[in-house]
Every structure is written in structure tokens, then in C-alpha cells.
């Protein structure tokens, strides 16, 4: 009955997510059969997070709303390795909103999940950010510098990247 109660718990947890994510892709974590980590299908996974590339073009505020409806946020990039993983799924001729903004226009950049902004772990293109009116960040490709960040007006529709914690069942 330990296995039975574990299954019941899993089912109720899955029901929680069903509203937004009718299908999950789960993998066994480690050697313990009881620990599964899941991402919504067709999200991709890296370390403890799931990622979704939204190809609809929307403003930053709408993009963040769109992610939150799915139980996620616009992506917060914490490491170079994470960015390297993310860019594998991006198109070079597109730009994608990040969960990074400067609402006050004072160059106090902030992440949507309140992760402290660390100047040492930023990947701005050279010369960026360059406009106080451009209060939202995108990631895009420049032939001279490959992938990096740029500040743009928040109201310019772009594609976006959503990120959520993996679902453990």
C-alpha cells in the first residue's frame, strides 16, 4: 500500500497541472524508481527547469502574462551553460524576450522571479544596453558576436522564452 498511496499522490499532482499541460514527459531521476521529473510536452528540459519557446509575437507584458498562465515566467538566465542550452532551440533571424526588465528606466535591471541581477553573469551585446526608454531585454543573434542580449522597447512584439521549475512526482 506504500506504492498505492504514492501512485494516488502522483495522480493528484498530475491533475493539478492538467489544466495547463494535458501531457507531461517524465524521466526517472537517478536510480530511485520513485523519483520522476517531468516537463510539459513539448517543453525542453535542462537541469532543474523546463523551457518553452513561444513563437507568437507579443509585447513583453503580454509575453510574461502568457508564460504565467502556463505556470511559468519569462526566462531567467543564471549561467552561461543555461544560455548555451537555450540558444540551441532559437532561430538566428528572431529575437526573444527574456524575463529581464528595467521598469524605472534607471538601469536597475531586474529578473521577473526576483533573482538578484548579477552584472558578472550578463551577456549583453557590445554597446548594450543603450537606451533608457528601452526597458525590456531580448536575446538575439548578431553575426559579429553570436548570441547576446539587447535592450528594446517593451511594447515591440517579439517571440519569447518561458521557464518553469521541473515537476517532481
Amino acid at each position: 500500500n506504500f506504492m498505492y498511496s504514492k501512485t494516488v499522490k502522483r495522480l493528484s499532482k498530475l491533475r493539478e497541472y492538467q489544466q495547463y499541460h494535458p501531457s507531461l514527459t517524465c524521466v526517472m531521476e537517478g536510480k530511485d524508481i520513485e523519483d520522476w521529473s517531468c516537463c510539459p510536452t513539448p517543453w525542453t528540459s535542462f537541469q532543474s527547469s523546463c523551457y518553452f519557446i513561444s513563437t507568437g509575437m507579443q509585447s513583453w507584458t503580454k509575453s510574461q502574462k502568457n508564460c504565467s498562465v502556463m505556470g511559468a515566467d519569462l526566462v531567467v538566465i543564471n549561467t552561461r551553460e543555461e544560455q548555451d542550452f537555450i540558444i540551441q532551440n532559437l532561430k538566428r533571424n528572431s529575437s526573444y524576450f527574456l524575463g529581464l526588465s528595467d521598469p524605472g528606466g534607471r538601469r536597475h535591471w531586474q529578473w521577473v522571479d526576483q533573482t538578484p541581477y548579477n552584472e558578472n553573469v550578463t551577456f549583453w551585446h557590445s554597446g548594450e544596453p543603450n537606451n533608457l526608454d528601452e526597458r525590456c531585454a531580448i536575446i538575439n543573434f548578431r553575426s559579429s558576436e553570436e548570441w547576446g542580449w539587447n535592450d528594446i522597447h517593451c511594447h515591440v512584439p517579439q517571440k519569447s522564452i518561458c521557464k518553469m521549475k521541473k515537476i517532481y512526482i
Epitope: K62, K65, N130, N131, L132, C136, C154, H155, P157
Partner: antibody, heavy 121, light 111 residues
Framework: EVKLVESGGGLVKPGGSLKLSCAAS????????MSWVRQTPEKRLEWVAY????????YYPDSVKGRFTISRDNARNTLYLQMSSLRSEDTAMFYC??????????????WGAGTTVTVSS | DIVLTQSPASLAVSLGQRATISCKAS??????????MNWYQQKPGQPPKLLIY???NLESGIPARFSGSGSGADFTLNIHPVEEEDAATYYC?????????FGGGTKLEIK
């Protein structure tokens, strides 16, 4: 006093070109995103183009994309709108307007008096 | 594009009474409690003039008889009490997503 003064309007034939200018004074021009907005003879307002303060990022609606080019000279405190392949439906009063940003929202807080463009054969 | 529908297209209000103008967006234009809707007044031969920004904030120098309200896709401009000098055309404008769009305008006549 914050001021925007447009010039360069006039009568032009369909298919022709025209360059509008907007002289700004009383504020740090390079710090502001600037727009051109037009008003049709039926009094409808339509945004035409905007340009960021530095770096020259430009944006246009589909109706003018490829025909109109917005530019600025921050040293001269001047905004420009180069219009080509003009059509009769481009006939309007053209206003230069300043964007003001506050958090994620923005608005046009300063407008020029406008310059009239008439496209007719 | 976000379409803004203003109503009525014109209205006549007696001096001292209330004028109410509605602006409906084809989709929500707010975020985090802020409505991305602005209101402008235009008198003949003049450019538009900012009255209200972010749905309910009065631009400096604008009389307190002007007020804005609303959220989501429904916004309202109120003028009370209406004065002679308020005869003009009023426009709403959304700044949530490009392209920025304007309502068709409401012409206010003072009776």
C-alpha cells in the same frame, strides 16, 4: 520651453517623394524616443514611425513599411521622415511627437503643430 | 493590431453636466494593475494634447474635472462639470503593444 516644430510639407504628385523635418528644443533630444503621427482629412489619427533615442532602432506600421524612413540627427536636435512612393491616402497632417516612458507604459506627451502633406495629381 | 472603438462618436452636454466617453479595446491592454490607455484632447487647428495617461493619471496642468478609469479592455473618460472650453474631439490611445493605435474620436459639443 519644450517645443517641436515640423516643416517640409506640401503638395506632391502620386509616386513622388517628400522629406519632413521636426526641430526640437527645450529638452535633451537624444534621450527620447520620437514618433511621426498623421491625421487624415477624416480626422483619424495613425502612428507612422518611431525611432529610439540612441542607436536608431526604427519601427513602422505595415501601411508605410518600405516607403517611409524615419531618422534623426541628435547633434542638430532634428527628426526626419523621408517619404517616397506617395499615394493619395497618405494625404494628412503630419505631427512629430515625443514619447514619455513610465515603467512599462508610455504616451505622447509633447506634439508639434503639424505640417500638411497633400498627395494629388 | 489592437482596435480601439470609441463611443459615442459625438455628444452634446449641457454646461456643468457630466460627459462620459467610452473606449473599448479588441483585447486586454493592462498589466500588473496598470491600464495602458491614454486620452488626448484636440481642438480645431491644434495638435492633440495629453489629458490622462495609464488609464487614470492626470497629466500635470490638466484640470481635475477630467478623470479616467477602467481596466482590461474597457476604459472611460469623464468630464465633470463640463465647461465651455471643453468643446473638442477626444481620442483614446493604447500603448501596450505595437503598433500604437488610436480610437476614432468623440466630438464633444457644449449645449
Amino acid at each position: 520651453e519644450v517645443k517641436l516644430v515640423e516643416s517640409g510639407g506640401g503638395l506632391v504628385k502620386p509616386g513622388g517623394s517628400l522629406k519632413l523635418s521636426c526641430a526640437a528644443s527645450g529638452f535633451t533630444f537624444s534621450s527620447y524616443t520620437m514618433s511621426w503621427v498623421r491625421q487624415t482629412p477624416e480626422k483619424r489619427l495613425e502612428w507612422v514611425a518611431y525611432i529610439s533615442g540612441v542607436g536608431g532602432d526604427t519601427y513602422y506600421p505595415d501601411s508605410v513599411k518600405g516607403r517611409f524612413t524615419i531618422s534623426r540627427d541628435n547633434a542638430r536636435n532634428t527628426l526626419y521622415l523621408q517619404m517616397s512612393s506617395l499615394r493619395s491616402e497618405d494625404t494628412a497632417m503630419f505631427y512629430c511627437a515625443r514619447h514619455h516612458y513610465s515603467h512599462y507604459f508610455w504616451y505622447f506627451d509633447v506634439w508639434g503643430a503639424g505640417t500638411t502633406v497633400t498627395v494629388s495629381s | 493590431d489592437i482596435v480601439l472603438t470609441q463611443s459615442p462618436a459625438s455628444l452634446a452636454v449641457s454646461l456643468g453636466q457630466r460627459a462620459t466617453i467610452s473606449c473599448k479595446a479588441s483585447q486586454s491592454v493592462d498589466y500588473d494593475g496598470d491600464g495602458f490607455m491614454n486620452w488626448y484632447q484636440q481642438k480645431p487647428g491644434q495638435p492633440p494634447k495629453l489629458l490622462i495617461y495609464a488609464a487614470s493619471n492626470l497629466e500635470s496642468g490638466i484640470p481635475a474635472r477630467f478623470s479616467g478609469s477602467g481596466s482590461g479592455a474597457d476604459f472611460t473618460l469623464n468630464i465633470h462639470p463640463v465647461e465651455e472650453e471643453d468643446a473638442a474631439t477626444y481620442y483614446c490611445q493604447q500603448s501596450n503593444e505595437d503598433p500604437p493605435t488610436f480610437g476614432g474620436g468623440t466630438k464633444l459639443e457644449i449645449k
